[in-house]
Interface confidence: low
């Protein structure tokens, strides 16, 4: 990965000597924890006949507040610690004079990373030990000698998960406009296997590369109004915790099984990504579970296939895209990738070819917005604890933090006239700048629909006239009848639907007798269960990729290779008339309800999945007894 002569792996490059622009003479006093690397820095690079001025700011949101590192100590014990003084040297920014430019670089030992100008992606890295003023190579990704990499997620596995693939719905959105919804946050946990550790040689080198990779991934996702925040890094410096196979589907299965076992004693995170030094079979460099973000299967495996970390960053962004419901671009008829150069591919192209992609296609964005409408995506709505973001509040990072009224990103990216991007305060006369109940810088009136009902287990939400955000997504009361089942936390789980999700359109629930088997380790069947709430038993369809199965008679149960984990019938699944699976047993519907909740809603609302009143348009919580207008009049109109 880091040979002594890095340029030996480049076909064509230009030597540049970056020049750091002097900072302002008077600097505000910085808190001592901000360390050696300045908050903002600018460099001039003479490359491809141009002088590029890069304006960079430290990515203060790279690490979550509870960021941990896990490794094996010399005595063989596993150690998890929260590193103190988390100063770092990872920056993001733009190129002066280029409106749609982007930059993501580390300045730790010279400049390393990428900057994008128009349709050109330039990579930069040091050629010697001369630091930031020393000789650097600037080159384009197609001049990096490497083999093309492909994604292992097959079209077959995508089909059943993503639904029909027509592009009539994909309307290109202007390149400079972010989706108008709230920012979403992926709290990321990265695992680095022993092969990668051996390749890089030390914990410090691994940490540096991972932070560089996540910094790049975060920059790529900011175009979608997403932030990617690293909450944990695990380095297998002694030995692998599970078998990392050259078969990426096996490795992914092992990662997800291991993650499920670790969940109780490791970070709560939205997504886990393995970076491996193992060479996957064939040209595959990544593999992911599709539409799995926020579920127990939210993860992917990535081969560190390129000398430049931008390579594995693009792979990780691609596999995370699958986790977020995106299909390969070439599978979608009429999919538009705005890349303008000849070999232009977007991030969700099935193969990365000879150049690194730098943007998401229109159809990727449409898939993403569709995924965000699902109840399961709720884990992305919660920002990491903003009171503790490493480095304290920083204006211009898309996080609305302590002391800020709004944050639309750095001035060069901000397109929000309701927010002053340099102060992160509301523009004069503005009541709000963000949120679905904010229109033209004003809070929408009470009772206006802000989140329509998605299906029969959902409830619609209305603006309350006071807050710019739409109220939290709420669902029909658990136990409300829905097609073939009973609503549970916004879903309508049935055996048939679960079997289809795993086994594809031909999947269906197995015979009732199958459910009297429990599968014990080693695929041994134990006929003792008296209900249908044990192992999910299916028939028909296609065996899911990367899953082992236990077969008893005509009953098919999904399991892991060692038989220690099997796919359960999910909580809330109908197991009989007026009965649902709850705590692994078939129980009466009344387990959902402690009291007659709806009676407390004064006929102006219904009970939701949290056993709280969900008021009709214009009525005020908690009991829908008063009109919102009355409540506001009594307490002043705005917060």
């Amino acid at each position: 990965i880091a040979p002594s002569r890095p340029w030996a792996l480049m076909e064509q490059y230009e030597v540049v000597l970056p020049w750091r622009l002097p900072g302002p003479r008077v600097r505000r006093a910085l808190p001592s924890h901000l360390g050696l690397h300045p908050e903002r820095v600018s460099y001039v690079l003479g490359a491809t006949g141009h002088n590029f001025t890069l304006h960079l700011r430290k990515n203060r949101d790279l690490l979550g507040s509870g960021y941990t590192e896990t490794y094996t100590a010399a005595n063989g014990s596993e150690v998890t610690e929260q590193p103190r003084g988390q100063d770092h040297c990872f920056y993001q920014g733009h190129v002066e004079g280029y409106p749609d430019s982007a930059a993501s670089l580390s300045t730790c030992a010279g400049l390393r990373g990428f900057f994008q100008v128009g349709s050109d992606l330039h990579l930069i890295e040091p050629l010697d030990e001369g630091g930031e003023g020393g000789r650097h190579a600037v080159y384009q990704a197609e001049h990096l000698l490497q083999t093309a990499g492909t994604c292992g997620v097959s079209d077959d596995s995508l089909g059943s998960l993503l639904g029909p693939r027509t592009a009539a719905v994909f309307r290109p959105r202007p390149g400079d406009s972010l989706p108008s919804r709230e920012t979403r946050y992926v709290e990321l946990y990265v695992v680095v296997d022993n092969a990668e550790f051996q390749m890089l040689g030390s914990e410090a080198a691994v940490r540096h590369r991972v932070l560089e990779v996540v910094n790049h991934v975060d920059k790529l996702y900011q175009k979608l109004n997403f932030r990617v925040v690293l909450v944990g890094l695990e380095i297998w410096n002694s030995q692998d915790r599970f078998h990392v196979s050259p078969d990426p589907s096996v490795t992914l299965e092992n990662l997800l099984t291991w993650q499920a076992r670790q969940r109780t004693r490791r970070h709560l995170h939205d997504n886990v990504q393995l970076i491996t030094g193992v060479d996957f079979t064939g040209t595959t460099v990544g593999f992911a579970r599709v539409s799995a973000m926020c579920s127990h299967s939210s993860g992917a495996v990535n081969q560190d296939h390129s000398k430049n970390p931008v390579g594995v960053a693009c792979t990780m962004a691609h596999e995370m895209g699958h986790n977020l419901g995106m299909d390969h671009d070439e599978n979608v008829q009429g999919c538009r990738c705005q890349e303008r150069f000849e070999a232009g591919r977007c991030i969700m192209a099935g193969s990365i070819g000879s150049s690194f992609p730098r943007m998401f296609s229109d159809c990727s964005q449409a898939y993403l917005e569709s995924f965000l409408e699902r109840p399961q995506s709720v884990c992305l709505a919660n920002a990491p604890d903003l009171s503790h973001l490493v480095g304290g509040p920083v204006c211009g990072n898309l996080f609305v933090e302590r002391g800020e009224q709004c944050d639309c990103g750095p001035p060069e990216d901000c397109r929000n006239r309701c927010c002053n991007s340099t102060t992160c305060q509301l523009a004069e006369g503005a009541q709000c700048a963000h949120g679905t109940c904010c229109q033209e810088c004003k809070v929408k009136p009470a009772g206006e629909l802000c989140r329509p009902k998605k299906d029969m287990c959902d409830l619609e939400e209305f603006c309350d006239g006071r807050h710019p955000e739409c109220p939290e997504d709420a669902f029909q009361e658990n136990g409300t009848p829905c097609s073939g089942g009973y609503c549970y936390n916004g879903a309508c789980p049935t055996l048939a639907q679960q079997c289809q999700a795993f086994w594809g359109p031909g999947g269906q629930a197995a015979e009732e007798s199958c459910f009297s088997y429990d599968i014990l380790p080693g695929c041994k069947a134990s006929r003792y269960r008296a209900d249908m709430c044990g192992v999910l038993q299916c028939k028909g369809g296609q065996q899911p990729l990367g899953r082992a199965i236990c077969i008893v008679d005509v009953c098919h149960a999904l399991t892991t290779e060692d038989g220690t984990a099997y796919e359960p019938v999910p909580e809330g699944t109908r197991c009989g008339p007026e009965k649902v699976c709850w705590k692994g047993r078939c129980q009466d519907l009344h387990v959902y309800r402690s009291s007659n909740c709806s009676a407390q809603c004064h006929n102006h609302g219904v009970c939701n999945h949290k056993q709280e009143c969900h008021c009709h348009a214009g009525w005020a919580p908690p009991h829908c007894a008063k009109l919102l207008t009355e409540v506001h009049a009594a307490s002043g109109s705005l917060p």
Partner: nanobody, 119 residues
């Protein structure tokens, strides 16, 4: 959360016996299945023996049938593995694991206890 602590491992001669104990604490009322697993040097983890907490349905891997017995004492929240006629190939780290009512996976694991059988 459920905490699991194993004890009883050690070094013995081939043909000897050992009894491993696994004491569970915390939300033990959630436990549905408990089991013993082992990992020998250079090998993957194997499921040795498991028992359902309520109705005592047991499972043994073929190579230990007739030699190992899994029992439990619900009052003490402890599961035992009686290992007789031990063989050198039984040498491994033995782990206790628990599966809860609302999970289909062994999500709680002990730290492991070393069993070494010399010939």
């Amino acid at each position: 959360e459920v905490q699991l602590v194993e004890s009883g491992g050690g070094l013995v001669q081939a043909g000897a016996s050992l009894k491993l104990s696994c004491a569970a604490s915390g939300r033990t009322y959630d436990i549905r299945v408990m089991g013993w697993f082992r990992r020998a040097p250079g090998k993957g983890r194997e499921s040795v023996a498991t028992t359902t907490w309520r109705d005592n349905i047991t499972y043994y891997m073929d190579s230990v049938k007739g030699r190992f017995t899994i029992t439990r004492d619900n009052a003490k929240n402890t599961v035992y593995l009686q290992m007789n006629n031990l063989k050198p190939e039984d040498t491994a780290v033995y782990y206790c694991a628990a599966q809860t009512e609302d999970s289909a996976q062994y999500i709680y694991w002990g730290q492991g206890t070393q069993v070494t059988v010399s010939s």
